[in-house]
């Protein structure tokens, strides 16, 4: 008789999840010499231990502490790029500007990027059928808690000038429900962070509006001003040209506004 299984609203664990995590860990530690000491089997065991046999709506940041410890990594605190609803461009940027880092350029972010996972209470099985959806089921699910934990730590580590890339095509350019709006912005440390610089990425080719005047951007400035962090904002009118100019800064067309 098949055992009754909880049916969640979200997609199930990504297929070949254990193999993917392990393979990503090996690849990352090979490419990044400073992380060569990491034992990827131990990393997988800690990752698994955070959610296996636990109710997928009762996961806590504490569950991920062993993994956080193993994945401890020092990135230059003044070279951090946060992003919200514009992951692909942020990643394209750090692939070119190699001295800047998104969360997904760190080991833990790289391991989990675009993956879904959850287990079941009291069984060692991984649930490949369905996992809790943040809105429809519960917020304390394995994936959401993981990203909340690593995002908080990443923001807490930032210093000097922190950059954030925001999607100017969205109705809420700064969204309080995004990871940036709900976690990262509140965990920047005023004693370390001098300025938050927002890059608002325009979508339309003919869009010449100053999106730095958008009410949600003003809201972002208001929030961080109370924490004594300075704020600056730049419109990136031509993201394609922006990337091109990061690759070839000496190009004559790169002196004009992008």
């Amino acid at each position: 008789v098949p055992r009754w299984r909880q049916q969640w609203s979200g997609p199930g664990t990504t297929k070949r999840f254990p193999e993917t995590v392990l393979a990503r860990c090996v690849k990352y530690t090979e490419i990044h010499p400073e992380m060569r000491h990491v034992d990827c089997q131990s990393v997988w065991d800690a990752f698994k231990g955070a959610f296996i046999s636990k109710h997928p709506c009762n996961i806590t940041e504490e569950d991920y502490q062993p993994l956080m410890k193993l994945g401890t990594q020092t990135v230059p605190c003044n070279k951090i790029l946060l992003w919200s609803r514009i992951k692909d461009l942020a990643h394209q940027f750090t692939q070119v500007q190699r001295d800047m880092f998104t969360l997904e350029d760190t080991l833990l972010g790289y391991l989990a990027d675009d993956l879904t996972w959850c287990g079941e209470f009291n069984t060692s099985k991984i649930n490949y059928q369905s996992c809790p959806d943040w809105r429809k089921d519960c917020s304390n699910n394995p994936v959401s808690v993981f990203w909340k934990t690593v995002s908080r730590r990443f923001a807490e580590a930032a210093c000097d000038v922190v950059h954030v890339m925001l999607n100017g095509s969205r109705s809420k350019i700064f969204d309080k429900n995004s990871t940036f709006g709900s976690v990262e912005v509140h965990n920047l440390q005023p004693e370390k962070v001098q300025t938050l610089e927002a890059w608002v990425i325009h979508g339309g080719r003919e869009d010449s509006r100053d999106l730095c005047q958008d009410p949600t951007i003003k809201e972002l400035e208001s929030i961080i001003s109370k924490r004594n962090i300075q704020f600056s904002c730049k419109n990136i009118y031509r993201p394609d040209k922006f990337l091109q100019c990061v690759k070839n800064p000496e190009d004559s067309s790169c002196t004009s506004e992008i």
Epitope: K172, K176, H186, Q189, P190, E191, P215, T216, K218, E219, E221, S222, I223, S225, K226, R227, N228, F231
Partner: antibody, heavy 118, light 109 residues
Framework: EVQLLESGGGLVQPGGSLRLSCVAS????????MNWVRQAPGKGLEWVSS????????YYADSVKGRFTISRDNSKNTLYLQMNDLRAEDTAVYYC???????????WGQGTTVTVSS | QSVLTQPPSASGTPGQRVTISCSGS????????VNWYQQLPGTAPKLLIY??QRPSGVPDRFSGSKSGTSASLAISGLQSEDEADYYC???????????FGGGTKLTVL
Amino acid sequence: EVQLLESGGGLVQPGGSLRLSCVASGFTFTNYEMNWVRQAPGKGLEWVSSISITGNYIYYADSVKGRFTISRDNSKNTLYLQMNDLRAEDTAVYYCANYKSYHGMDVWGQGTTVTVSS
Amino acid sequence: QSVLTQPPSASGTPGQRVTISCSGSSSNIKNNLVNWYQQLPGTAPKLLIYNNQRPSGVPDRFSGSKSGTSASLAISGLQSEDEADYYCAAWDDSLNAWVFGGGTKLTVL
């Protein structure tokens, strides 16, 4: 002239309700977070609630949580405070004040008096 | 009981320098925006100092400073019109709230 003008105060019995309004003029209301601050007779200032520019972030003092509701109508340049289940300890002059980034509450209204008594 | 602690009263003679202290914690004064407000008798409060700076129109006799979890307001060349209540305020990260000191009544003798 930059101005905030409160109204809606009055005498109300314990358990009753009142709705305060605050009309802004002389500045771009939609660029500012707004606050309600109160002052009981002979006492100090007590922050009551704040609402962000778009209304996405709303905060309340513990003493009014669940009873008071802050809101704003940007098209009318108006801030509101709906006060329910009023208690004697809510008796105070209620001020609205804007929050200017990096500055503080730099424009205050003249205040409206709320008296809760049977 | 206020989150920020101020002395209830202070006094000085005309021309003197008076300092009012405000004590808080790392979740408010230490890292965040600190303001001082002046409330003259029977009037609404007025922003006097923000982040140790003066809004336009505030005389340079008023100055603010901050060290760790404490802030202070200094008034030099005290004048009779400075007789008022003075409040410190700061945003508190852990409470997600503006917190005020209990106020200091300044008397010019």
